[in-house]
Amino acid sequence: SEVEYRAEVGQNAYLPCFYTPAAPGNLVPVCWGKGACPVFECGNVVLRTDERDVNYWTSRYWLNGDFRKGDVSLTIENVTLADSGIYCCRIQIPGIMNDEKFNLKLVIKPAKVTPAPTRQRDFTAAFPRMLTTRGHGPAETQTLGSLPDINLTQISTLANELRDSRLANDLRDSGATIRIG
């Protein structure tokens, strides 16, 4: 499975991934990694849960949803162009080769700057030498990475508001979802 999500530099990105626990509290280990899903595990792990809790995370990466109910969607805080790429959400279902894995594409748009002093843009991996040339500065609210065909401005609510909104259901329907049990 492969879907693309977008966010703007300086904002928070949201990568949806869900499963349905067989029973309340009967959790399945999950890992998030940078780069496409390998055969086993996650490469370049940024966050991991076990049967009870989040047991490993790195700065800027967190689960904002209720992971105990199977919402293991990843939020990446204050993104840069270097966060562009493929992210692997792996639901580590017990048994041989039972894992469900999802490759999600995250595209980061450069923050726009007004006025435009030059026509040349240096789209680095934002590694340090990023130059952008137009538009407005980063939004004051933290815009979440959008689904395809959903405008960023349409979903500029804070990440924790998203969980209770109707959009959460839309994300659940079009994001990575797996039912267990």
């Epitope: 780069g35 790429g85 594409k105 595209v107 789209f123 030498r129």
Partner: antibody
């Protein structure tokens, strides 16, 4: 699925001009930069430049500043490159390539257009 | 312009061997290096971006490492279908530049 379909091979005279088209499908044309890359026989890859189809903003390799003209036709989701005053040194396969999105690694490539410059 | 140098034009290997291809940048490019595979008569295929990260559909045997100016692309167990030319590319600053390529051959 994403497809980039380039125009056919061309035999051109030195000093004339050559136009190559790259018709795209399977994605939102204005959401990604389109790049042009060339490969001379038995050689490496050389980035010519890129164009943002949303506003036709162009970034060109200085080496090709006076040679390459990049345009887009949004109505047909097509990118074009015109190459002026070619010499035998410009005989190469020319590729259009779509980037990942605001970062310059090239995920999708056209099949290439062979340009032969010969008198 | 940043010059990307692949010192070996050719490398010989045997099936199931481990092989590493190196690429040197003329200045610091942080971790902004991609690797491509090109088979005869085909277009380049993105394998690795930002030094370490495999693109979708790329087998686990392909890995990348390095930082700054020195980068390495490794195939941990070469398969027959891996015989191709491999290019590095910096995506740190324009103009984006490629290495000259390393052709992987069977001994």
């Amino acid at each position: 699925q994403v497809q980039l379909q380039q125009s056919g091979p061309q035999l051109v005279r030195p000093g004339s001009s050559v136009q190559i088209s790259c018709k795209t499908s399977g994605y939102s044309f204005t959401s990604y930069l389109m790049h042009w890359v060339r490969q001379r026989p038995g050689q490496g890859l050389e980035w010519i430049g890129s164009i943002d189809p949303s506003d036709s903003e162009i970034s060109l390799n200085q080496k090709f500043m006076d040679k390459a003209t990049l345009t887009v036709d949004k109505s047909s989701s097509t990118a074009n490159m015109q190459f002026s005053s070619p010499t035998s040194e410009d005989s190469a396969v020319y590729f259009c390539a779509r980037d990942f999105g605001y970062v310059a690694w090239f995920v999708y490539w056209g099949q290439g257009t062979l340009v032969t410059v010969s008198a | 312009d940043i010059v990307m140098t692949q010192s070996h034009k050719f490398m010989s290997t045997s099936i199931e061997d481990r092989v590493s291809i190196t690429c040197k940048a003329s200045q610091d490019v942080s971790a902004a290096v991609a690797w491509y595979q090109q088979k005869p008569g085909q277009t380049p295929k993105l394998l690795i971006y930002s030094t370490f990260y495999r693109y979708i559909g790329v087998p686990d045997r392909f890995t990348g490492s390095g930082s700054g100016t020195d980068f390495t692309f490794t195939i941990t167990s070469v398969q027959a279908e891996d015989l191709a030319v491999y290019f590095c590319q910096q995506h740190y600053s324009v103009p984006w530049t490629f290495g000259g390529g390393t052709k992987l051959e069977i001994k």
